[in-house]
Interface confidence: medium
């Protein structure tokens, strides 16, 4: 079986200060089980933006219904967006254990945020 | 209830090293960005550092860079303030809070912990 | 860097009066503004976030407005445990985040 793959088709997506930012990820395969993260930024100063497990994230909704276990879309939108969101945001795949581990990046989209049109 | 406690303060001489600790409880420590604010006497508020919910994001202020480091034991619900090298300057008041959300405003502080650098 | 200038540094309000204290940001923080409230020998509490919402707990009495770069905070009937230093923080860029000098509240 081929494994798994996380598709982030977006290179760069530019929004408007005030408006929201969609984050498009989708995995090839249910297997292995396990949650996917998203987090701004790469390496160990990387920050936790969503997880679909535990946490509070009220600015971030799930584009689709994450929580279905045949879901392989795990695109994201961002409310309110501001300056300080701008950066480089990864859809990260985990294998379910304990602790979980990390398995396959997406390449990343860039976020840009444009001046709020007068 | 949310409670956050900051203990470790205390008086030192200049050049010397203190930590801070900051018990958090009543919440889920674990999900979210925490922050160290400090207020010199008779002075106003000031940001001094930050961590995100993971430990693995950190912001400091020009001030601090390169002497304080900001940690967190998310198993034990502690905050940390390891601060270096310290300054007369840096005798002040040290608060912890806790961020609404990863970008967002401070929704509970902490009573504060009280730093007197002074030779 | 943003910079936050309040006004005035200090107001003398009768009780029952209206308190009104003015943050001013140096470039636009959208409605990433908080307001916080430090009592004599306490801990800052937050009252305002997001400009004009109040925080679980806080009287009525307090108001925000403003967004861009000019924002508000109004006490609409000063009571006496009111008396304070209050504080206005952005969140719209950071690092750093920034407060204001603060506006010392006192009853006439």
């Known amino acids: 079986e081929e494994e798994l793959q996380v598709i982030q088709p977006d290179k760069s997506v530019s929004v408007a200060a005030g408006e929201s930012a969609i984050l498009h990820c989708t995995v090839t395969s249910l297997i292995p089980v396990g949650p996917i993260q998203w987090f701004r930024g790469a390496g160990p100063a990387r920050e936790l933006i969503y997880n679909q497990k535990e946490g509070h994230f009220p600015r971030v909704t799930t584009v689709s219904e994450s929580t279905k276990r045949e879901n392989m879309d795990f695109s994201i939108s961002i409310s309110n967006i501001t300056p300080a969101d701008a950066g480089t945001y990864y859809c990260v795949k985990f294998r379910k254990g304990s602790p979980d581990t990390e398995f396959k990046s997406g390449a990343g989209t860039e976020l840009s945020v444009r001046a709020k049109p007068s | 209830d949310v409670q956050l406690v900051e203990s470790g303060g205390g008086v030192v001489r200049p050049g010397e090293s203190l930590r801070l600790s900051c018990a958090a409880s009543?919440?889920?420590?674990?999900?979210?960005?925490m922050n160290w604010v400090r207020q010199a006497p008779g002075e106003g508020l000031e940001w001094v550092s930050r961590i995100d919910s993971g430990g693995g994001g950190t912001d400091y202020a020009d001030s601090v860079k390169g002497r304080f480091t900001i940690s967190r034991d998310n198993s034990k619900n502690t905050l940390y303030l390891q601060m270096n090298s310290l300054r007369a300057e840096d005798t002040a008041v040290y608060y912890c809070?806790?961020?609404?959300?990863?970008?967002?405003?401070?929704?509970?502080w902490g009573l504060g912990a009280p730093v007197t650098v002074s030779s | 860097e943003t910079v936050l200038t309040q006004s005035p540094a200090t107001l003398s309000v009768s009780p029952g009066e209206r308190a009104t204290l003015s943050c001013r940001a140096s470039q636009t923080v959208g409605s990433k503004l908080a307001w916080h409230q430090q009592k004599p020998g306490q801990a800052p509490r937050l009252l305002i976030y997001d400009a004009s919402n109040r925080a679980t707990g806080i009287p009525d009495r307090f108001s925000g407005s403003g967004s861009g770069t000019d924002f508000t905070l109004t006490i609409s009937s000063l009571q006496t445990e009111d008396s304070a230093v209050y504080y206005c923080q952005q969140y719209y860029y950071w690092p750093p985040y920034r407060f204001g000098g603060g506006t010392k509240v006192e009853i006439k």
């Open positions: 009543g919440f889920s420590f674990r999900s979210y960005a």
């Open positions: 809070a806790k961020q609404y959300d990863w970008n967002s405003f401070f929704d509970y």
